[in-house]
């Protein structure tokens, strides 16, 4: 199963890009296109990303791009860089020579025998850098998405394939499945690979059946598997939770709408800093767990769970994973409490002293004898116990 | 302009080893990437190899890799092809190419040709 993420990602921030880049395969990807499939050709040398040349891009490495990237083959040749020299020659001899010249550390080229990627490799310095770029749209437009799960790191898979997003059926669908998913998404690894109806069901096509990853691969549509089958209906859409998903819950207060504030992150729960634990972060909060508004935020107490969550919100966020946050850096909120809050719909605003039991509450254990809690809310958040 | 000479070619029994050489007139011969392109018997041109301005890049044929290397000396001018274990199938022209903008893989990017040096390889 999945590990933990390494050392070098546990200090994070809602400002850094994604854990995993696009293009395992081939280190490459597209970038400033109408799509995910689309675009100017970037290929990545050692921890940057650089574009390609397009004095030397043809249409094998047009096409084996556009393979690698799932995005089926590519379009017109009319989408690639003119054939033409890239720069005319230098001046005549005599002149100083420009060898030692900055453009001599010019643009890297992706090369290729044939339209596949395993054909093609990325040569440094192919070609000085006179800013043209190469360029390619694909034929077919891929992707990847999580719906309904409070967030982009959690929910029902769905994929687009030919114009149309669609589910995936749940039948042996796990936790290798679910990684692939969480980690083409950037959204780390998988917590849960969940079965159908922990999410709303889907409207549209099942795109795929009987998914079977090794947990290598780049691409969920690079996995083996089956086109979806009449057989499986929306009750059995695939799932999946992964551990750059953030759900809350208020613990230790009179209901589930009072109490210490703890995020679920990375596969475990975490405190809040209430260094800047302000109205607005407490007001989104109350909102997003069906809470109605923050109604005072009482005073908390030490930290007791292993990481530690700072949010900063301007008050109008759905949720507190939209405001800019920042998990576990050396100097979070080091002389803070874990911050608490009462929100105005807990009964001990009503002098009640009955706890609410939360509506509609199922309890199931999936994988590894992990408990799973759901709460049928309107955010349809997933409280993992 | 830029004249390239190769030189090196003949024949050669399958297994044996040949060395190109192709020399410029150009003073900046530094400036230039070079590479090798051939044309086989009733065959179209095809790219050998080739490398960058100052010889840290390298690229080459599938059909070559492993078995010949590029190299450059730019204080004299040459370009080089170590060409080890030959077949029959490697019989062809071999013309030496240069170019300013990018390393000489595609033809449309080729500024100068040489003349060319023929290797037959005997099986």
């Known amino acids: 199963h999945p590990s933990p993420a390494p050392p070098d990602q546990l200090n994070t921030s809602s400002a850094e890009s994604e854990l995993w880049e696009p293009g395992e395969r081939l280190p490459v990807r597209l970038t400033n296109g109408s799509s995910s499939c689309s675009g100017t050709v970037e290929v990545r040398l050692e921890a940057s990303w650089e574009p390609a040349c397009g004095a030397l891009w043809d249409s094998r490495a047009a096409e084996a791009v556009c393979r690698a990237l799932g995005c089926g083959g590519a379009e017109a040749a009319s989408q690639l860089a003119p054939p033409t020299p890239e720069l005319p020659p230098p001046p005549a001899a005599g002149n100083t020579s420009v060898a030692a010249n900055a453009t001599l550390a010019g643009a890297p080229a992706l090369l290729c025998s044939g339209a596949e990627w395993r054909l093609c490799e990325v040569v440094e310095h192919a070609c000085r850098s006179d800013g043209r770029r190469a360029r390619v749209t694909c034929a077919e437009n891929r992707a990847l998405r999580l719906v309904d799960g409070g967030g982009a790191c959690a929910g029902r898979v769905e994929m687009l394939e030919h114009g149309e997003w669609g589910s995936v059926c749940d039948d042996t669908w796990d936790l290798e499945d679910a990684h692939v998913v969480c980690r083409q998404l950037g959204c780390g690894w998988a917590v849960q690979a969940l079965p159908g109806l922990h999410f709303t069901p889907g409207r549209g096509p099942i795109h795929r059946d009987q998914v079977n990853c090794s947990g290598a691969e780049a691409y969920l549509w690079d996995c083996p598997g089956l086109p979806g089958q009449h057989y499986c209906g929306h009750k059995e859409d695939a799932g999946a939770v992964c551990s750059e998903h953030q759900s809350w819950r208020l613990t230790g207060g009179a209901d589930r709408c009072e109490g210490q504030v703890e995020v679920h992150f990375r596969g475990v729960w975490n405190t809040v800093c209430d260094s800047e634990w302000y109205p607005s972060e407490a007001k989104v909060l109350c909102q997003s767990l069906g809470c109605g508004t923050a109604v005072e935020r009482p005073k908390g107490l030490p930290h007791s769970l292993s990481g530690r969550m700072y949010y900063s919100c301007n008050g109008e966020e759905l949720t507190l994973s939209n405001c800019s946050w920042r998990f576990n850096n050396s100097n979070l909120c080091s002389q803070s409490l874990a911050a608490r809050v009462l929100c105005s719909a807990s009964r001990s605003l009503h002098n009640l002293s009955t706890p609410e039991v939360p509506a509609s509450v199922q309890t199931v254990t999936i994988e590894s004898s992990v408990t799973v809690k759901i709460e049928n809310k309107e955010s349809r958040e997933l409280m993992l116990l | 302009q830029v004249q390239l000479q190769e030189s090196g070619g003949g024949l050669v029994q399958a297994g044996g080893s040949l060395r190109l050489s192709c020399t410029a007139s150009?003073?900046?011969?530094?400036?230039?990437?070079l590479g090798w392109f051939r044309q086989g018997p009733g065959k179209e041109r095809e790219f050998v190899a080739a490398?960058?301005?100052?010889?840290?890049?390298?690229y080459y044929a599938d059909s070559v890799k492993g078995r010949f290397t590029i190299s450059r000396d730019n204080a004299k001018n040459t370009l080089l092809l170590q060409m080890n274990s030959l077949k029959p199938e490697d019989t062809a022209v071999y013309f030496c190419?240069?170019?300013?903008?990018?390393?000489?893989?595609?033809?449309?990017?080729?500024?100068?040709w040489g003349k060319g040096t023929q290797v037959t390889v005997s099986s």
């Open positions: 190419v240069a170019s300013w903008g990018a390393m000489p893989v595609l033809t449309h990017v080729i500024n100068y």
């Open positions: 490398i960058n301005w100052v010889g840290g890049s390298t």
């Open positions: 150009e003073r900046t011969f530094s400036d230039y990437a």
